[in-house]
């Protein structure tokens, strides 16, 4: 996250540190708690790493630092990848991870509600992005779980900005015209959330921009609300039924 | 598969013009910085130039500024590198690789996807 | 510019060797070195990127170490197939590879 400031503890207790365990261990992508067994992430997150013994989910924490061997972690029961998404394309940026085991809820740890199916009218005000990702462009991973608030821009606008892309109905978009705050590499996969009625809500997922936080050049989010179909479809038929935290 | 394939490459005289190109398949090209590196015989490699993935910033090496220009086509999925003025020391072989990306993940740095390279040889 | 110098140039080593090569750097450039593996007539091939992260599918016998300014490319049990030129890269300000460092057969 660039321009952002720390966390404090259960602010976001949604957020999830998706790592990978090789030789070493390191924070690869961010993610979002939507249910006792489900985290919602971005499909590039596993460009070449598919496996799912590889990686380890941690939830219910605010500094990576404080991650020890003795640290609990989940691990995957299945990853779940769009299937229009390519790695040659780049669009249907989402995947779905089942954790081997459900997860209790705590004040640190619970999930992030849905949006509706297609949302369109909501005009959203207050949106933040959260993540443990370089804090610029030639920056590394951040200890303490970083937040920024960032307007989201309309696709015409940010269509405007990626003349060379295309920036479909199924992203959303969002940044400051001058830059200074973004989202950055590690944050893919974390969330765009956005409160109101007092109410916070997964609208999107990080997934690219060129650069971070540069004049301009918005950040692009896969946009949850054309996803519901297929997340409620997924979930449920591996589950019996949604567990998921959609709006009343 | 993800793939670079150069071409281009041959023999030309000193002050001579070149056009290399890279083809590249298997992964978002548009998403992605794109790289020229070159090993002249018995050295080591250098990089030579580089270019954002929209394009719109380009950075070159000083030993080939204001000789060589690259520039990409994303929907042709093609990099390529023009070559001005050539001189005998421009005599490698230029290798295409893939740079960090647009994406956000923590994958980022080295060039991870490189061509097998396509010899230039400038000589009288 | 940063420049990068690479030692030993050349070393000769045995099957089953613990194989150190270490790069510095003119001038700080963080965890934004990245270390290649090279043999004539293939495409150079990453290794390890960020100092110290292994790349996917590279055996684990290869780690990489260091930041600022010093850092250094082990190989814990050298292999056959290890035997090969290696280049570090500062990617922190635009990109510099360092001389190489071939790896010979003792």
């Known amino acids: 996250i660039v321009g952002g400031t720390n966390s404090s503890w259960g602010e976001w207790p949604w957020q999830v540190s998706l790592q990978v365990k090789l030789t070493a261990q390191r924070h690869l992508c961010g993610g979002s708690l939507i249910g006792h067994q489900w985290v919602l992430t971005a499909a590039h997150c596993f460009d070449g790493l598919p496996l799912q013994d590889v990686w380890r989910i941690y939830s219910g924490i605010l500094n990576l630092s404080d991650i020890t061997k003795d640290t609990p972690f989940s691990q995957i029961k299945e990853i779940i990848i769009h299937q229009n998404y390519k790695v040659s394309e780049g669009n249907h940026d989402i995947a779905l991870i089942k954790l081997q085991a459900p997860l209790n809820y705590t004040e640190f740890q619970k999930p992030i509600c849905l949006p509706s199916k297609g949302d369109t009218s909501t005009i959203y005000t207050n949106c933040w992005v959260t993540g443990w990702g370089f804090s610029k462009e030639k920056g590394e991973i951040q200890n303490i779980l970083q937040k920024v608030n960032i307007p989201l821009v309309t696709n015409e606008e940010c269509q405007k900005r990626y003349q060379d892309y295309k920036i479909t109905q199924r992203m959303v978009c969002a940044g400051y015209k001058e830059g200074g705050k973004d989202a950055c590499k590690g944050d893919s996969g974390g969330p765009l959330v956005c409160k109101h009625n007092g109410m916070w809500r997964l609208v999107g997922i990080t997934s690219w921009g060129e650069g971070c936080a540069r004049r301009e050049q918005p950040g692009v989010y896969t946009k949850v609300a054309e996803y519901m179909d297929w997340i409620l479809e997924k979930t449920q038929s591996s589950d019996g039924k949604a567990q998921m935290q959609s709006p009343a | 598969e993800v793939q670079l394939l150069e071409s281009g490459g041959g023999l030309v005289q000193p002050g001579g013009s070149l056009r290399l190109s890279c083809a590249a398949s298997?992964?978002?090209?548009?998403?992605?910085?794109m790289n020229w590196v070159r090993q002249a015989p018995g050295k080591g490699l250098e990089w030579v130039s580089s270019?954002?993935?929209?394009?719109?910033?380009?950075n070159y090496a000083d030993s080939v500024k204001g000789r060589f220009t690259i520039s990409r086509d994303n929907s042709k999925n093609t990099l390529y590198l023009q070559m001005n003025s050539l001189r005998a020391e421009d005599t490698a072989v230029y290798y295409c690789?893939?740079?960090?990306?647009?994406?956000?993940?923590?994958?980022?740095?080295?060039?991870?996807?490189w061509g097998l390279g396509t010899m230039v040889t400038v000589s009288s | 510019d940063i420049q990068m110098t690479q030692s030993p140039s050349s070393l000769s080593a045995s099957v089953g060797d613990r194989v150190t090569i270490t790069c510095r750097a003119s001038q700080s450039i963080s965890v934004y070195l990245n270390w290649y593996q090279h043999k004539p007539g293939k495409a150079p091939k990453l290794l390890i990127y960020?100092?110290?992260n292994l790349q996917f599918g590279v055996p684990s016998r290869f780690s990489g170490s260091g930041y600022g300014t010093d850092f250094t490319l082990t190989i814990s049990s050298l292999q056959p197939e290890d035997f090969a030129t290696y280049h570090c890269q500062q990617t922190f300000s635009l990109f510099t590879f360092g001389g190489g460092t071939k790896v010979e057969i003792k």
């Open positions: 298997g992964f978002t090209f548009s998403f992605y910085n």
């Open positions: 270019i954002s993935p929209s394009g719109g910033e380009t």
């Open positions: 960020g100092a110290s």
């Open positions: 690789a893939r740079g960090g990306g647009a994406y956000r993940n923590n994958w980022w740095g080295g060039f991870d996807i």
